[in-house]
């Protein structure tokens, strides 16, 4: 994400088009309180961060309110008056959507439709991952809206599901972050379960007459 400038590595995360977090890792300045200066308009004066993140007692990042912005963040990380990293970035290219809310499951025979509240902005993928104890890895299906139908399930098996949201790479690029996963929920025969057995129970032997 952020290449080195005087040994400074930066990371930007734009949480759900609400809050921007810029963090830095500067080995050369590891015991220094670097300051963060920013503006959203190239013609304005820089403001200094009022909400610093601290690591081992020294500044390591800044949190900014940036509600529903699709503009450029101009920023400068400084050691006193000396800029050690200066850049401007389109914030949306560092989007991390919020975790899916109001996840619901609607069962119909060997299929389940997973729905949740769509986020207020677009160009997202809603991904459902699922597995049974018989599966060696998670299966995945994704759609452009939070309405994902998974077919071909075995009604007798217990399945674990979780959901997340991803920014479409074609639009937002490779520097975004998927949302955190929703809580895992387990289902069997259309009913919610506390958990799925980690190891599948072997089939009961048929008793010979």
């Amino acid at each position: 994400q952020g290449g080195a400038a005087e040994g400074v590595q930066i990371q930007i995360i734009y949480f759900n088009l609400e809050t921007v977090q810029v963090t830095w890792n500067a080995s050369k300045y590891s015991r220094t309180n670097l300051t963060f200066h920013y503006r959203f308009n190239g013609d304005e004066a820089y403001d200094q961060c009022t909400n610093y993140l601290l690591q081992e007692g020294h500044t390591s990042g800044c949190l900014l309110d940036a509600e529903q912005r699709d503009d450029i963040l101009y920023f400068s990380i400084r050691n006193g008056t000396h800029p050690v990293f200066t850049a401007s970035r389109w914030m949306v290219y560092y989007l991390k959507p919020s975790s899916p809310k109001h996840v619901r499951f609607s069962w119909h025979q060997d299929a389940v439709t997973v729905t949740c509240s769509d986020l207020s902005y677009g160009d997202l993928l809603y991904e459902v991952q699922y597995r049974s104890p018989f599966d060696t890895e998670w299966q995945s299906k994704q759609e452009n809206t939070c309405n994902v139908t998974i077919e071909g399930l075995d009604a007798e098996k217990c399945y674990s599901f979780w959901v997340r949201v991803k920014a479409m790479e074609d639009v937002y690029g490779p520097d975004t972050y998927p949302s955190d996963w929703s809580e895992v929920t387990c289902w069997q025969r259309g009913e919610i379960r506390d958990a799925c057995a980690e190891t599948p129970t072997p089939p009961k032997p048929k008793l010979s007459k």
Partner: antibody, heavy 118, light 107 residues
Amino acid sequence: EVQLLESGGNLVQPGGSLRLSCAASGFTFGSYVMTWGRQAPGKGLEWVSTISASGGSTYYADSVKGRFTISRDNSKNTLYLQMNSLRAEDTAVYYCAKDKWGKGFDIWGQGTMVTVSS
Amino acid sequence: DIQLTQSPSFLSASVGDRVTITCRASQGISSYLAWYQQKPGKAPKLLIYAASTLQSGVPSRFSGSGSGTEFTLTISSLQPEDFATYYCQQLNSYPPTFGGGTKVEIK
């Protein structure tokens, strides 16, 4: 096919106005940052203006600030550049371009020629 | 504004030659550098972005390297269709700025 097609270039007198259009096709226009650039005859490339995907944020080169206005109509898949108080030094081929994640301009139109002369 | 200095500004080479063009930035720009090819009367074409990532559809004989202030575009084996003008562009800090160009001509 992803395509940008500029129009509106012409011969105009100093102090005059012109409106350039850029019609986009083959991609979801309203999802992308868009840019105007230009190239004076025999010279290099120069960035002119950029607009965010929603149209809510605009950026201009110092040389055109206060004279040029970039805008877009996402329902018509069209980008515009309104050019006022034109000067001889604005004579150039004007290109519209699509932004690639803030790391380059990956699709360019064929260009439209603007000549400012009396 | 960040200045980009390209060198050489003019280059004479033969088909099959290995060609290297340099772009120097007046201050650190991380890896926010793009390279374009432009032929006479045509629009620029993106070759490389993020200093070293090849744009889809661009032949693999083109490569980019560098970070910070010094960058290079290399054409491993020059082809007849590669004779053109090449520009670097920084996008680390607005306004985006271009280098002055390098014209590659046939020897």
